[in-house]
Amino acid sequence: ARSEDRYRNPKGSACSRIWQSPRFIARKRGFTVKMHCYMNSASGNVSWLWKQEMDENPQQLKLEKGRMEESQNESLATLTIQGIRFEDNGIYFCQQKCNNTSEVYQGCGTELRVMGFSTLAQLKQRNTLKD
C-alpha cells in the first residue's frame, strides 16, 4: 500500500491527516512567529483554532487584521503572527474540513510561549526544555 493510503479514513475520503509544526514556539514579545500544517491533499480549507489553557476547548481564532495572517497552498497552511503579545500565549490548532465529507481533521497543536526579553543563557535553558 502507498504510504498516503494509511492516512485516508476508513470511508476512503480524500481528506488527509495533517501534521502541525512546530509543536512548541518560545519567542520574544514583539517578534514574529510562524506555524505550519502539512497536508497530503488540498481537499479542504484549513482554519485555525486557539485555546489559552490546556483544559479549555479550542475556539475559532479571530484573525487580528494586519497582525495575523493565514495562507494556504496545495499542501501547506501557515499562520503568521507579527508583533506577538503576552495575550497571544496558548495553543494553536489547524483544522481541515473535507470538501466531500463532513469530516474534520485537526493538527496536534502548536504551543506559543511569548517571552520577555532575557539573557541568552535563559533562552538556551528554555530551548533545552523545548527540545
Epitope: 514583539g30 517578534f31 514574529t32 510562524k34
Partner: antibody, heavy 119, light 111 residues
Framework: EVQLQESGAELVKPGASVKMSCKAS????????MHWVKQRPGQGLEWIGA????????GYNQKFKGKATLTVDTSSSTAYMHLSSLTSEDSAVYFC????????????WGQGTLVTVSA | DIVLTQSPASLAVSLGQRATISCKAS??????????MNWYQQKPGQPPKLLIY???NLESGIPARFSGSGSGTDFTLNIHPVEEEDAATYHC?????????FGGGTKLEIK
C-alpha cells in the same frame, strides 16, 4: 511627515543622571516600538533597549540594565530615556528610533542627543 | 550575543564602480525563511538611515543602485554604480535575537 525630535545636548558631572526626550510626530505613537541606540565618538552603534508605547512594556540590552530606564508619555507622544550614575563611558550620542514590530527594522531616527560626562 | 563582523573596515571605490560590503553573523539571523538583517548608511553628524531591510528589501526612496543579499550568517550590501553622495559609513544590524546588534561599520570613500 514622520519626525523624531530629540532634546538638546547635555553636559553632566560624573555620578549624576540625565533624562533625554524624543518627541514623535507624523504617525500614531502607540503603533510603533521606540528603541534607543548609543554611539560613542568614532565607534559603532549599540542597542540599549526598546519600549512599546501601547502598554509601556520594555526590553533592555542586559549591558544597560540598571543604567538606562525607558518611559513614554502617550499624551504628548514623547519617549524618554533616563541614564543614571554617569561615567566617562556614557559620553556618547544617543539616538531614538522606531520600529513597527519589536524586531523589525529601524525606519526613522531622531537627530541624536549628545551627552558629555565631564568633571 | 550575536556578533556581526563587517569587512572591509574601509574601502575606496572609483566613481561609477561597484562597492561590496560583507557582514558575517556569529550565528544565523534567519527565522522561518526570513532574514532579520538590515543595512544603514550614516554620514558624519547625522543619524543612520535605513537602506535595506530583511536582507534584500529596498527601503522606500532609496536609489536602486543599493542592493542587499544573503541569508543565514552571510550578507552583502552592493552599491553600483557608486556616486559621490555615497561616501559614508555603512552598518549592518540583526534583529532576530535580542540584544539587537550592529556591525562595526564600513567607511566608504569615493576616489
Amino acid at each position: 511627515e514622520v519626525q523624531l525630535q530629540e532634546s538638546g545636548a547635555e553636559l553632566v558631572k560624573p555620578g549624576a543622571s540625565v533624562k533625554m526626550s524624543c518627541k514623535a510626530s507624523g504617525y500614531t505613537f502607540t503603533s510603533y516600538w521606540m528603541h534607543w541606540v548609543k554611539q560613542r565618538p568614532g565607534q559603532g552603534l549599540e542597542w540599549i533597549g526598546a519600549i512599546d508605547p501601547s502598554d509601556s512594556y520594555t526590553g533592555y540590552n542586559q549591558k544597560f540594565k540598571g543604567k538606562a530606564t525607558l518611559t513614554v508619555d502617550t499624551s504628548s507622544s514623547t519617549a524618554y530615556m533616563h541614564l543614571s550614575s554617569l561615567t566617562s563611558e556614557d559620553s556618547a550620542v544617543y539616538f531614538c528610533t522606531r520600529s513597527y514590530y519589536g524586531n523589525s527594522w529601524f525606519d526613522y531616527w531622531g537627530q541624536g542627543t549628545l551627552v558629555t560626562v565631564s568633571a | 550575543d550575536i556578533v556581526l563582523t563587517q569587512s572591509p573596515a574601509s574601502l575606496a571605490v572609483s566613481l561609477g564602480q561597484r562597492a561590496t560590503i560583507s557582514c558575517k553573523a556569529s550565528q544565523s539571523v534567519d527565522y522561518e525563511g526570513d532574514s532579520y538583517m538590515n543595512w544603514y548608511q550614516q554620514k558624519p553628524g547625522q543619524p543612520p538611515k535605513l537602506l535595506i531591510y530583511a536582507a534584500s528589501n529596498l527601503e522606500s526612496g532609496i536609489p536602486a543602485r543599493f542592493s542587499g543579499s544573503g541569508s543565514g550568517t552571510d550578507f552583502t550590501l552592493n552599491i553600483h554604480p557608486v556616486e559621490e553622495e555615497d561616501a559614508a559609513t555603512y552598518h549592518c544590524q540583526q534583529s532576530n535575537e535580542d540584544p539587537f546588534t550592529f556591525g562595526g561599520g564600513t567607511k566608504l570613500e569615493i576616489k
